[in-house]
């Protein structure tokens, strides 16, 4: 092809190359064709008779303004057709006549601001029309019942101020899962307009000025219809009362979508009507009290998204949202609720009570005042078979013995990102039998006992990033109980010391992260007594992370046990020499990483075993002695291996000999070197 | 099913010192600490101490760590328990135990070793 | 060191009684406490771990309860085999004291 569009598996992409017609030498085989954001005026039909196969074409982001009708007859086969960000205005009965097949149509962002006569009456298997960011002033697409199988209407973007039911009757045969009205300045529901509409089950109307009056009105126009999803984002709908959902009693609403709506009161029996209900989401509000019986008749929400409802209106504490107690328990089938991002002054002892089915809690960020965890924080949820909480970012300083008592189903247990500063005697964690990860990273301080999580041998996963860890070189260990434990994170706690014993009987241990600590001196042949062999037993490690830890020595035999990593991070260290044999029991290591350390030699005998199987290696910034002994088969391995090494041309540097300094190691020069060959 | 059984009884005289064992079977030795109970006649029990059969490391009563020393063997399972300098009032029943998947309890005991002090 | 007191050291009841008995710690040991039976020339049995968590085999007529200092075992209703000594033990630092004991004695 003389274009220099790439073509693979029958598509065709020609986008982004300045195309001022449409390319003549494709295949002839093509079934989708992409010419968007190109320079293309008109599509000639005749242009097209060679691609007679295609079922879709693109052609959005070029200035067509005239469609000839002829095209779909040359395209027989058509099914997508794409014409998004054109300069259409007018669309003729005969513009569209022979696109029988369409099943999706794109006009968003033409210039299409009236439709006369009937276009698109031949499309009778189309799903989806697409005529948003138009100029419509009206929803009037035709005078006749047609497009019996739709789906999909999108009207946003336009200029539609009413509804009226003899403009949508052409759907009179339709069933439409989404009706899309949004960013219109509706101001008039005319009676029976959704009646019209054979079946309306989605109707979307965000960023619409609806407000309080409105909405009551557009729910009265829709009893009685099969609407499932009304969506009515940002619809300045600040109150509700008992009555302005009324109309939604005669349907089966499942889906309600009240977000961002600056919604302030929240009246009781507000959603009484909607006992079908199972998704509802009023995040981004402004809720100033939840009463008792705000959310009455919610008897089959499953999932209620309350994110940045509850949020103060000024520095006053008086002006705290307020949440009465029981004002959930209408929530019987509640599985997901997320209360993040909020400003609630604390847990009453009823806040949760009925939540009968709630599986899902998350409360990051949502309290002002919830310093301490007690034995009674969390007593409305005993009777919730609570699975996962987040509990992150609530500046809680202290877990008190039994708080999370009442949880006994509790799996996943997220206390990141907060202030908590003690000492761990375990009791913290009674009643978590089933509990799978504890997520504690990023606090102020843990000092931990033998007992830490002597009630929790069922963790799997224990989450202790930078939290100033103390006392992790007791013994017994503070993980002995944690035989179950598959992934451990111990990083960024400074640690300087540990026994030999921290991590033994762990052997299910799969991840083990310990980077940016101190753990040098551990690994010294000096060190009093020899170096500590704090990796041994955990024949099921994969994933070992030391980086940033100072190491400068590895005694020989301390990776020996893990004979089933498969990724190791050595990087960021002061390594220089390794010994030989070091990585011999590293058979299924996958990759290494020793990126910044002063490694000056890769000899056989030390990466030989380590680099057999590798996918990836970063040894990058490292002063490689350009000689030789030192890399000679280093580079011969390079140069036929597999392995993928990131930026292998501009990071892998010769620091010496002087002469050799700087040039990259891959291009050194092996012929002169005997015996240096990679494989053998 | 996890057994301890212990050496059989024994008659020392004072200032004299005496060892009893604990062969561990049933579950992998390494694996939990064994730790050392005593209960002389008509006496409460009384914790000793405790060893890690993997790499030797001990934790003991202050009352008792001039005169004990707790060892063990793992080639053949074993841990054991010496006390010198024997006094009468040493005359006890010595046990050890071994804590379960829950680490606060001692769900397993040895049968017990009575070693009698007398000139 | 923490000391562990029990009571009363003896207790004598019949078949069929509840029966209680009280540990006291001198500090604070959260609820690392285990219950043992012994009878004479046996070592003891584990009844009740975790102040009130009940050990495999145990029979449900035996209960614990109580946290911090202050704990108790309870027989809902004494059976023969029930007559023995039952030691109090905490599990919260070395050294892990035991009590002294309660002689539970037919009437």
């Known amino acids: 092809s003389t274009t220099k569009c790439t073509v693979s598996h029958e598509v065709a992409d020609c986008s982004h190359l300045k195309l001022t017609q449409v390319p003549d030498d494709l295949p002839t085989n093509i079934t989708v064709l992409n010419l968007t954001h190109n320079q293309l005026r008109r599509l000639p039909a005749a242009n097209f008779t060679r691609y007679s196969q295609l079922t879709s074409l693109d052609v959005g982001f070029n200035t067509i303004s005239k469609l000839e009708p002829e095209l779909c007859q040359k395209l027989p086969m058509l099914k997508v057709l794409n014409l998004q960000h054109n300069e259409l205005s007018q669309l003729s009965d005969k513009t569209f006549a022979f696109c029988t097949n369409l099943t999706e149509l794109h006009l968003m962002s033409n210039s299409i601001q009236k439709i006369k006569n009937n276009p698109f009456v031949k499309q009778k298997n189309l799903i989806t029309l697409d005529l948003s960011h138009n100029g419509l002033s009206s929803t009037k697409l035709g005078t006749q019942v047609q497009l019996e199988n739709l789906q999909e209407l999108l009207l946003s973007n336009n200029k539609i101020q009413a509804l009226k039911s003899e403009e949508l009757d052409i759907f009179a045969n339709s069933s439409l899962k989404k009706l899309e009205l949004s960013s219109n300045q509706i101001k008039e529901f005319s009676p029976g307009c959704f009646h019209a509409i054979g079946r309306l089950f989605g109707l979307f109307l965000n960023n619409v000025q609806l407000g309080p009056s409105l909405t009551e009105k557009l729910c009265l126009e829709l009893a009685n219809t099969s609407i499932r999803n009304l969506s009515l984002s940002n619809s300045q709908l600040s109150t509700t009362s008992n009555t302005t959902f009324l109309g939604l009693k005669w349907t089966n609403l499942t889906m309600l979508d009240l977000s961002y709506n600056n919604l302030n009161v929240v009246g009781n029996d507000s959603f009484a009507w909607l006992p079908q209900l199972e998704y509802f989401f009023l995040e981004y509000n402004n809720i100033q009290h939840l009463f008792s019986h705000s959310l009455h008749g919610l008897f089959n929400v499953r999932y209620l998204n309350l994110k940045r409802s509850f949020t103060k209106q000024s520095i006053s504490l008086a002006s705290l949202p307020k949440i009465d107690d029981f004002s959930f328990q209408w929530l019987k089938c509640l599985e997901h609720l997320n209360m993040e991002d909020n400003d609630i002054p604390g847990i009453k002892s009823n806040m949760f009570t009925g939540l009968i089915n709630l599986k899902y809690l998350s409360l990051s960020n949502s309290f002002t005042s919830l310093r301490t965890l007690t034995n009674e924080t969390f007593v409305s949820l005993a009777h919730s078979p609570l699975h996962i909480l987040n509990l992150t970012k609530n500046k809680i300083s202290k877990i008190e013995s039994d708080a999370f008592s009442w949880l006994g189903h509790l799996e996943v247990l997220d206390l990141g990102l907060n202030e908590i500063g003690q000492e761990l005697t375990g009791q913290e964690w009674r009643g978590l039998e089933n509990i799978f990860e504890i997520y504690l990273s990023y606090n102020k301080y843990l000092q931990l006992t033998r007992n830490s999580f002597a009630l929790v041998p069922s963790l799997q996963r224990l989450m202790l990033r930078r939290v100033a860890l103390k006392n992790v070189d007791s013994s017994p260990s503070p993980f002995q109980p944690l035989r179950n434990l598959t992934i451990l994170d111990l990083s960024n706690n400074n640690i300087a010391n540990i026994n030999d014993d921290m991590l033994e009987g762990l052997e299910k241990l799969e991840i083990l992260d310990l980077q940016h600590n101190n753990l040098a001196r551990l690994w010294k042949h000096a060190n009093p007594g020899g170096p500590i062999y704090f990796l041994k037993g955990l024949s099921h490690l994969h994933i070992l992370n030391l980086e940033s830890n100072g190491f400068d020595e590895i005694p020989v035999e301390v990776f020996k046990d893990l004979f089933e990593l498969k990724i190791i991070d050595l990087g960021l260290n002061n390594l220089n020499t390794l010994p030989a044999s070091v990585f011999n029991n590293q058979v299924s290591l996958k990759s290494l990483n020793l990126q910044k350390n002063l490694i000056t030699s890769v000899e056989k005998k030390v990466f030989g075993p380590a680099f057999r199987n590798l996918t990836e290696l970063d040894m990058r910034f490292n002063p490689f002695d350009c000689t030789c002994e030192s890399i000679a088969w280093f580079v011969n391995w390079i140069n036929e291996t597999h392995t993928n090494i990131p930026e292998l041309s501009s990071h892998y540097l010769c620091n010496t000999p002087p002469h050799y300094h700087g040039f990259p190691v891959r291009l050194f020069d092996t012929s002169s070197c005997k015996d240096s060959a990679p494989f053998e | 099913q996890v057994q301890l059984v212990q050496s059989g009884a024994e008659v020392k005289k004072p200032g004299a010192s005496v060892k009893v064992s604990c062969k561990a079977s049933?579950?992998?030795?390494?694996?939990?600490?064994i730790h050392w109970v005593r209960q002389a006649p008509g006496q409460r029990l009384e914790w000793m101490g405790e060893?890690?059969?993997?790499?030797?490391?001990?934790n003991y009563n202050e009352k008792f760590k001039t005169r004990v020393t707790i060892t063990r063997d793992t080639s053949a399972s074993t841990a054991y328990m010496e006390l010198s300098s024997l006094r009468s009032e040493d005359t006890a029943v010595y046990y050890c135990a071994r804590v379960g998947v829950m680490i606060t309890t001692f769900p397993y005991w040895g049968q017990g070793t009575l070693v009698t002090v007398s000139s | 060191d923490i000391q562990m007191t029990q009571s009363p050291s003896s207790l004598s009841a019949s078949v069929g009684d509840r029966v209680t008995i009280t540990c006291r710690a001198s500090?604070?040991?959260?609820?690392?406490l285990a219950w043992y039976q012994q009878k004479p020339g046996k070592a003891p049995k584990l009844l009740i771990y975790?102040?009130?968590t009940l050990a495999d085999g145990v029979p449900s007529r035996f209960s614990g309860s109580g946290s911090g200092t202050d704990f108790t075992l309870t027989i809902s209703s004494l059976q023969p085999e029930d007559f023995a000594t039952y030691y109090c033990q905490h599990f919260w630092s070395t050294p892990f004291t035991f009590g002294q004991g309660t002689k539970l004695e037919i009437k």
């Open positions: 060893i890690n059969p993997n790499n030797g490391r001990i």
């Open positions: 975790n102040a009130k």
């Open positions: 049933g579950y992998t030795f390494t694996t939990y600490w």
């Open positions: 500090g604070n040991i959260h609820n690392y």
